[in-house]
């Protein structure tokens, strides 16, 4: 038997995809086990295998169909268990009613590029991935720059509380290397959070001319 | 600008069944959700269901679910409600509606039933 | 079925003044709360989403908030144009409820 702690967490990208960390204190590190979703009001379901991150804990992505198909909508629940073999039978570690629109967290943003560059100025695009039509324009976005010689960690928060696929940086130094990241985060849903960061998007300055300034 | 321009007013017997019309400009039809929304005298606004166009699919209040449904067709961008087995206590005014699936966005300027024998 | 209660049902309030309307869910919706403004002759209109988000121009002066299971809409300055019906709906359960409505008349 497997004892201690467990906790069983997953998020729903609003399209096709659920993802699941499973956390269990004292789990056995070699026990096959797995994510199986069965939808209140669908005719499919679906298992995936959890695969360790860490010393005691697991994730593995629920993939229900093309990564652009509106698979559920926010009538729906999800039971999800973790199922782990014992032997020859499959014992329930986990289960929760899982209401999708209520656990949101999309995928990060893709496709940042430069706009327009400055010696003092930025503007920046991106794209949102996977995003259910759903939202509407209803979508906040959390921007930071990463300046010489800090870390992400001390970059301040730029948020946009609206959907704004863009952004122009101000107060920029001259010739200098800069790095930008992004994320998005729906209104709906009492357990959504952040998305992931975007992957970074590296830019520089152009140098002020000399005697004057652009 | 995002518009519904919905039917005219209908006058409807008993037992009947009446179709709304709601066309609709402005955005991508085929990425919408249409609600359709009854507010009959004195009862306040209740909503009646949906039609998601982008998964093609339906959801109604179980109090509607026997009696209503809602169609699109994408090459018009034109949502339709339709009512059956008409009774005098659906004489309302019905509003088709575009949002999300939590609340509704724009509306559509009503269309008026009127159930008399 | 989750059961929205609004009051009061009418609210008297002279112009310039801050007019207070309240909506009580039966049981726990979150921030699951919307509110609509319905002038006569006109289709509802939404102001505010998920409790406190105003709709992009929404004028300022109106505003939600949240405690447990009761949700206010406050406006700050009354207009002339703000006497109206205004309905709040949730969209934790289906299916989706509206209050009866609170009634918002010139003193």
């Known amino acids: 038997a497997v004892n201690g702690t467990s906790q069983f967490t997953c998020f729903y990208n609003s399209r096709a995809n659920i993802s699941c960390v499973w956390s269990q204190d004292g789990a056995l590190q070699d026990t096959s086990c797995q994510v199986h979703a069965w939808p209140d009001r669908r005719r499919w379901n679906q298992t995936c295998e959890l695969l360790p991150v860490s010393q005691a804990s697991w994730a593995c992505n629920l993939i229900l169909g093309a990564p652009d198909s509106q698979k559920l909508t926010t009538v729906d629940i999800v039971t999800l268990r973790v199922l782990c073999r014992e032997g020859v039978r499959w014992r329930v570690m986990a289960i929760q009613d899982f209401k999708p629109f209520e656990n949101l967290r999309l995928m990060a943003p893709i496709s940042l590029q430069v706009v327009h560059v400055e010696t003092h100025r930025c503007n920046i695009s991106w794209e949102i991935s996977q995003a259910s039509h759903y939202f509407e324009r209803h979508l906040e976005f959390e921007a930071r720059t990463l300046s010489p010689g800090h870390t992400w960690e001390e970059a301040p928060l730029l948020t946009l509380k609206q959907k704004q696929e863009w952004i122009c940086l101000e107060t920029l130094t001259p010739d200098t290397q800069y790095e930008f990241q992004v994320r998005v985060k729906p209104l709906q849903g009492e357990f959504t959070t952040w998305s992931p960061w975007s992957q970074p998007l590296a830019f520089r300055t152009k140098p002020a001319a000399l005697g004057k300034d652009t | 600008e995002v518009q519904l321009v919905q039917s005219g007013a209908e006058v409807k017997k008993p037992g009947a069944t009446v179709k709304i019309s709601c066309k609709v400009s402005?955005?991508?039809?085929?990425?919408?959700?249409i609600h359709w929304v009854q507010q009959a005298p004195g009862k306040g606004l209740e909503w009646m269901g949906w039609i998601d166009n982008e998964a093609g699919e339906t959801e109604y209040a179980p109090g509607f679910q026997d009696r209503v449904t809602i169609t699109a067709d994408t090459s018009t961008d034109t949502a339709y409600m339709e009512l059956s087995s008409l009774r005098s206590e659906d004489t309302a005014v019905y509003y088709c509606?575009?949002?999300?699936?939590?609340?509704?966005?724009?509306w559509g300027q009503g269309t008026t039933v009127t159930v008399s024998s | 079925e989750i059961v929205m209660t609004q009051s009061p049902a009418t609210l008297s309030v002279s112009p310039g003044e801050r007019a207070t309307l309240s909506c009580r869910a039966s049981?726990?919706?979150?921030?699951?709360l919307h509110w609509y403004q319905q002038k006569p002759g006109q289709a509802p209109r939404l102001l505010i989403i998920y409790g406190l988000q105003s709709i992009s121009g929404i004028p300022a002066r109106f505003s939600g908030s949240r405690s447990g299971t009761e949700f206010t809409l406050t406006i700050s300055s009354l207009q002339s144009e703000d006497f109206a019906v205004y309905f709040c709906q949730q969209s934790n359960n289906f299916p989706y409820t509206f209050g009866q409505g609170t009634k918002l008349e010139i003193k």
């Open positions: 402005g955005f991508n039809f085929k990425y919408s959700l």
């Open positions: 509606a575009r949002g999300g699936p939590w609340f509704l966005s724009y």
């Open positions: 049981q726990i919706i979150s921030n699951n």
